[in-house]
Interface confidence: medium
C-alpha cells in the first residue's frame, strides 16, 4: 500500500491556511473536487466542494473555506480563513469520479493551529489584496455523500472543524496572515 505522507502547517488563530492541490490536467480539469477532514478512525468528511462540473477559477465559499479550481494550471486552491484552534487536524483534497471512489491528491495536510495574537483583519503583519470579493454561497448540497473506505486513518488528533456559513461576505482584501509555503521545482 502507498504510504500516506503529510505536510505540516503551523499557524496561529486568525491566520489563513492557503494551499494548493495539484492534479493531472487532462484527466481531472472539469471534475468536481472536494476538501475533506479526516477525524480519528472515521471516514473523511467533506467540508466543501467545487461545482459539478468544476468551473475554472470560480470561487466557491462554504463558511470559512474558499475553493478555486485553476484548470489551466491543474491546481485547486484551498483557503481556510480566520483559523481556530479547533480547526487543527488532518485534511486532504479529493477528486470525485463517480462511480469510482474519490481520487486523493497527495499529500495530506496536517494543520496545527495554536493560540496567539493575530489581531484584527488589517492590523497584522501583512496585507492581502484581491481583485474580487467572494459571495457567501453554500455548496454543501452539491457534494457527494460517499467517501472512500481506504482513506480511514490511524488516530490523527481530534478536530471539530465543522464549518458554518456566514451571513455576510468575506472581503479578501481584509484577510491577513495568509501562509504560503513553497513549491520548488
Amino acid at each position: 500500500a502507498t504510504k500516506l505522507t503529510e505536510e505540516k502547517y503551523e499557524l496561529k488563530e486568525g491566520q489563513t491556511l492557503d494551499v494548493k492541490c495539484d492534479y493531472t490536467l487532462e484527466k481531472f480539469a472539469s471534475s468536481q473536487k472536494a476538501w475533506q477532514i479526516i477525524r480519528d478512525g472515521e471516514m473523511p468528511k467533506t467540508l466543501a466542494c467545487t461545482e459539478r462540473p468544476s468551473k475554472n477559477s470560480h470561487p466557491v465559499q462554504v463558511g470559512r473555506i474558499i475553493l478555486e479550481d485553476y484548470h489551466d494550471h491543474g491546481l485547486l486552491r484551498v483557503r481556510m480563513v480566520n483559523l481556530q484552534v479547533e480547526d487543527s487536524g488532518l485534511y486532504q483534497c479529493v477528486i470525485y469520479q463517480p462511480p469510482k471512489e474519490p481520487h486523493m491528491l497527495f499529500d495530506r495536510i496536517r494543520l496545527v493551529v495554536t493560540k496567539g495574537f493575530s489581531g484584527t483583519p488589517g492590523s497584522n503583519e501583512n496585507s492581502t489584496q484581491n481583485v474580487y470579493k467572494i459571495p457567501p454561497t453554500t455548496t454543501k448540497a452539491l457534494c457527494p455523500l460517499y467517501t472512500s473506505p481506504r482513506t480511514v486513518t490511524q488516530a490523527p488528533p481530534k478536530s471539530t472543524a465543522d464549518v458554518s456559513t456566514p451571513d455576510s461576505e468575506i472581503n479578501l482584501t481584509n484577510v491577513t496572515d495568509i501562509i504560503r509555503v513553497p513549491v520548488f521545482n
Epitope: K20, D22, R77, N130, R180
Partner: antibody, heavy 127, light 107 residues
C-alpha cells in the same frame, strides 16, 4: 529555467515614487510567483512583498503597507514594484525573485519563492 | 514578526574546512527555512529550501538540517568560491524574514 531582467538604476527626490520592472523569460509567466526584496547599503535582505499573477493577489510586508504596489502584466511577462513617498532610507538595491509554483505534483505548498533572482536595481533617494 | 538570529555573524575559515552556520527562529517554523549565498555586488543565490532540500545546481558540499526553531547550514569542505555572506530566511508566515547574515571570510 526562467531568467529575470530588471530595469536600470534610478535617482529620485524625496517624496517622489519609483517603479521598478522585472521582465521574465524562459518560462510560463503565469506559472511563477514573484517576490521583491531590498537591501540597503551594507545591510541585510528585507522582504517587501510578492504577487502570484494567476491568483490576482499581492501580499505586502506591513512596514511598506500603503507605500508599495506590486503588479504583474502577463502580456509582457513583467512584474512591477512601485514605491511611493520615497525617503532617504529607501536608498537600496531592489531585487525581484521568482519561483515556479504550479504543477509540482505532490506538494501542496506554494509561496513567493526566491529561486531565481534578477540582477538588482539601485534606487538612490537624494535631494 | 518572526525573528531570525544567525550565529556567528562572521567566521574565518580555510579552504577544506568544515563550516557550520546556525539560524534560530523566535517561534516554530516547521521546516520552512531557506538559505541563500550572496557575494559582494551580486544578487543572492538560493542554496537550500525546506530546511534540507538542495536547490538544483548547488554543489553537494552544502547541506541543511533542522526543524522547528533551530537550523544549520553546513559546508563540508570549503572551496575558494564559498567565501561570501549567508542568509537564512523563514517562510512559515508573513512577513517573510531573514537572518542578519553570516560573513564567511578567508583565514
Amino acid at each position: 529555467q526562467v531568467q529575470l531582467v530588471q530595469s536600470g538604476a534610478e535617482v529620485k527626490k524625496p517624496g517622489s515614487s519609483v517603479k521598478v520592472s522585472c521582465k521574465s523569460s524562459g518560462g510560463t509567466f503565469s506559472s511563477y510567483a514573484f517576490t521583491w526584496v531590498r537591501q540597503a547599503p551594507g545591510q541585510g535582505l528585507e522582504w517587501m512583498g510578492g504577487i502570484i499573477p494567476i491568483f490576482r493577489t499581492a501580499n505586502y510586508a506591513q512596514k511598506f503597507q500603503g507605500r508599495v504596489t506590486i503588479t504583474a502584466d502577463e502580456s509582457t511577462s513583467t512584474a512591477y514594484m512601485e514605491l511611493s513617498s520615497l525617503r532617504s532610507e529607501d536608498t537600496a538595491v531592489y531585487y525581484c525573485a521568482s519561483s515556479h509554483f504550479s504543477g509540482s505534483g505532490s506538494s501542496h505548498y506554494y509561496y513567493y519563492g526566491m529561486h531565481v533572482w534578477g540582477q538588482g536595481t539601485t534606487v538612490t533617494v537624494s535631494s | 514578526d518572526i525573528q531570525m538570529t544567525q550565529s556567528p555573524t562572521s567566521l574565518s575559515a580555510s579552504v577544506g574546512d568544515r563550516v557550520t552556520i546556525t539560524c534560530r527562529a523566535s517561534q516554530g517554523i516547521s521546516s520552512w527555512l531557506a538559505w541563500y549565498q550572496q557575494k559582494p555586488e551580486k544578487a543572492p543565490k538560493s542554496l537550500i529550501y525546506a530546511a534540507s532540500s538542495l536547490q538544483s545546481g548547488v554543489p553537494s558540499r552544502f547541506s541543511g538540517s533542522g526543524s522547528g526553531t533551530d537550523f544549520t547550514l553546513t559546508i563540508s569542505s570549503l572551496q575558494p568560491e564559498d567565501f561570501a555572506t549567508y542568509y537564512c530566511q523563514q517562510y512559515n508566515s508573513y512577513p517573510y524574514t531573514f537572518g542578519q547574515g553570516t560573513k564567511l571570510e578567508i583565514k
